[in-house]
Interface confidence: medium
């Protein structure tokens, strides 16, 4: 099982994201909408605009997901799209609230095994590769709502029913209460609230802040784990360098995470993943001889 895989990688025990963003409000710059005789003005935001073919992408992803996951076959994807659209269309893209997404949350309600949740921060690709192999574990993007929105950008315009394909608010330069940030904050909070028993989190050991309080994991998920349900948060620190044998579980930011978690009456443990490629290989083929001996 997983313990053998960890053992095979000289894992050391230490008992004991999505982008979340600073709450900074900006207004965006006003630019003329055309060179006609009656110039109109529209908001020019600092971030990229809505992903091309956004409606079609959301609808197609919904159909694909519900086909693959029998437990979600009851979901009406047109209603899901209507609810998604309703959360941000005609609304000021700096004034979006969690309540705006409630109809979508309701339609996307999904039960995942609460003891099989994998959180991640700044290392999405490896987390997804892992759950693709370890099929009984789930990241947020393995749920319907996370799958729908993964890697997409969207926003509307106040008082018009148009999607803004040109620009959307950047969380730092414009505002934090934008459609994308509020969506991820909402679904991340719900995902963390649902977790139980041992919750795993994959962290990027190559970053200067292995645990970042300003990430979605650090600012939303950590604070919404329920101490009455969650016994342990287990961090997996993923090493980047081939010859990197440092114990990153001793990193000051990991100690900070341990402190936050302990204060919430949840136990904390940490493991180094020295060889992520080897780690994935051993998850795929646990019987491999190199996965039962220490490397």
């Amino acid at each position: 099982g997983l313990n053998d895989i960890f053992e095979a990688q000289k894992i050391e025990w230490h008992e004991g994201s999505h982008h979340h963003h600073h709450h900074h409000h900006g207004s965006g710059s006003l630019v003329p909408r055309g060179s006609g005789s009656v110039p109109r003005w529209r908001q020019q935001w600092s971030g990229p605009g809505t992903t091309k073919r956004f409606p079609e992408t959301v609808l197609a992803r919904c159909v694909k997901y519900t086909e693959i996951h029998p437990e979600m076959r009851h979901v009406d994807c047109q209603s899901v799209w209507d609810a998604f659209k309703g959360a941000f269309i005609s609304k000021h893209p700096c004034n979006i609230t969690e309540e705006d997404y409630q109809p979508l949350m309701k339609l996307g309600t999904q039960t995942v095994p609460c003891n099989k949740i994998l959180l991640w921060s700044r290392i999405k690709d490896l987390a997804h590769q892992f759950t693709q192999v370890q099929r009984d574990m789930f990241t947020l993007e393995d749920t319907l709502l996370g799958y729908l929105a993964d890697d997409l950008t969207w926003c509307g315009e106040f008082n018009t029913s148009k999607i803004n394909y040109q620009s959307c608010p950047d969380w730092r330069k414009d505002c934090s209460n934008n459609p994308v940030s509020v969506f991820w904050k909402t679904v991340s909070r719900r995902f963390a609230e649902a977790a139980c028993d041992v919750v795993h989190v994959m962290l990027n050991g190559s970053r200067s802040k292995i645990f970042d309080k300003n990430s979605t994991f650090g600012s939303v998920e950590v604070h919404n784990l329920q101490p009455e349900k969650v016994q342990t948060l287990e961090a997996w620190v993923i090493h980047g360098g081939r010859e990197d044998s440092r114990d990153l579980c001793q990193d000051p930011t990991i100690k900070e995470l341990e402190s936050i978690i302990s204060k919430r009456n949840i136990q904390f443990s940490c493991k180094n993943i020295y060889r992520p490629d080897k780690f994935l290989q051993c998850v795929k083929n646990p019987e491999d001889s190199s996965c039962t001996s220490e490397i």
Partner: antibody, heavy 119, light 111 residues
Framework: QVQLKESGPGLVQPSETLSLTCTVS????????VNWVRQPPGKGLEWMGR???????DYNSALKSRLSISRDTSKGQVFLKMNSLQTEDTAIYFC?????????????WGPGTMVTVLS | QFTLTQPKSVSGSLRSTITIPCERS????????VSWYQQHLGRPPINVIY?????PSEVSDRFSGSIDSSSNSASLTITNLQMDDEADYFC??????????FGGGTKLTVL
């Protein structure tokens, strides 16, 4: 100044493949999208598809199975291939620049090239 | 996908004002911007209005565009009609996936 010009064969046999080239100047294909639009004699305009400035491609769903759009950014050329031609594909074929600015219209057009599918 | 419906022909006398409507079949006319093109015989189309009511700088201020929610239509209005305005006019919009939709075109005759 901005210019687009279509080129290709004037006559095509039924069931053959049409290959057209749109050569642009005065702007970069990495900054603007290029669309293909056709107009049968005496009829209206039909959008066929586009290649975005980032290289991604969209097709009119009614023509999707027969169409292929590509480009060579270094030469400033956009290519249209359409297979299984029939007489109803006889039309003037235009390429048009589509600015990526949220309004989705065409600010510059080529003069068009007439393609006749022989009956 | 919606359609855009225009009258086949419209006529007006010299120096008069005409309006060409363009009706959207489903969804709100305000959901997506409308543009207008003028096409003289044997020539490529020229954009005369974009973003519902915006006019390119080189286009005469006799051309104006508007949208009307009550009729779910866009309109192109040409004032002080000139002989050179005799042409085909096409409205154009796009769906939410930015697929382009043209109206069938209106032949304007100047009497």
């Amino acid at each position: 100044q901005v210019q687009l010009k279509e080129s290709g064969p004037g006559l095509v046999q039924p069931s053959e493949t049409l290959s057209l080239t749109c050569t642009v100047s005065g702007f970069s294909l990495t900054s603007y999208g290029v669309n293909w639009v056709r107009q049968p004699p005496g009829k209206g305009l039909e959008w066929m598809g586009r290649i975005w400035n980032d290289g991604s491609i969209d097709y009119n769903s009614a023509l999707k199975s027969r169409l292929s759009i590509s480009r060579d950014t270094s030469k400033g050329q956009v290519f249209l291939k359409m297979n299984s031609l029939q007489t109803e594909d006889t039309a003037i074929y235009f390429c048009a620049r589509g600015p990526y600015n949220n309004y989705w219209y065409f600010d510059f057009w080529g003069p068009g090239t007439m393609v006749t599918v022989l009956s | 996908q919606f359609t855009l419906t225009q009258p086949k022909s419209v006529s007006g006398s010299l120096r008069s004002t005409i309006t060409i409507p363009c009706e959207r079949s489903s969804g709100d006319i305000g959901d997506n911007y409308v543009s207008w093109y003028q096409q003289h015989l044997g020539r490529p189309p020229i954009n005369v209005i974009y973003a519902d009511d915006q006019r390119p700088s080189e286009v005469s201020d006799r051309f104006s565009g508007s949208i009307d929610s009550s009729s779910n239509s866009a309109s192109l209005t040409i004032t002080n009609l000139q002989m050179d305005d005799e042409a085909d006019y096409f409205c154009q919009s796009y769906d939410s996936n930015i697929d382009i939709i043209f109206g069938g075109g209106t032949k304007l005759t100047v009497l």
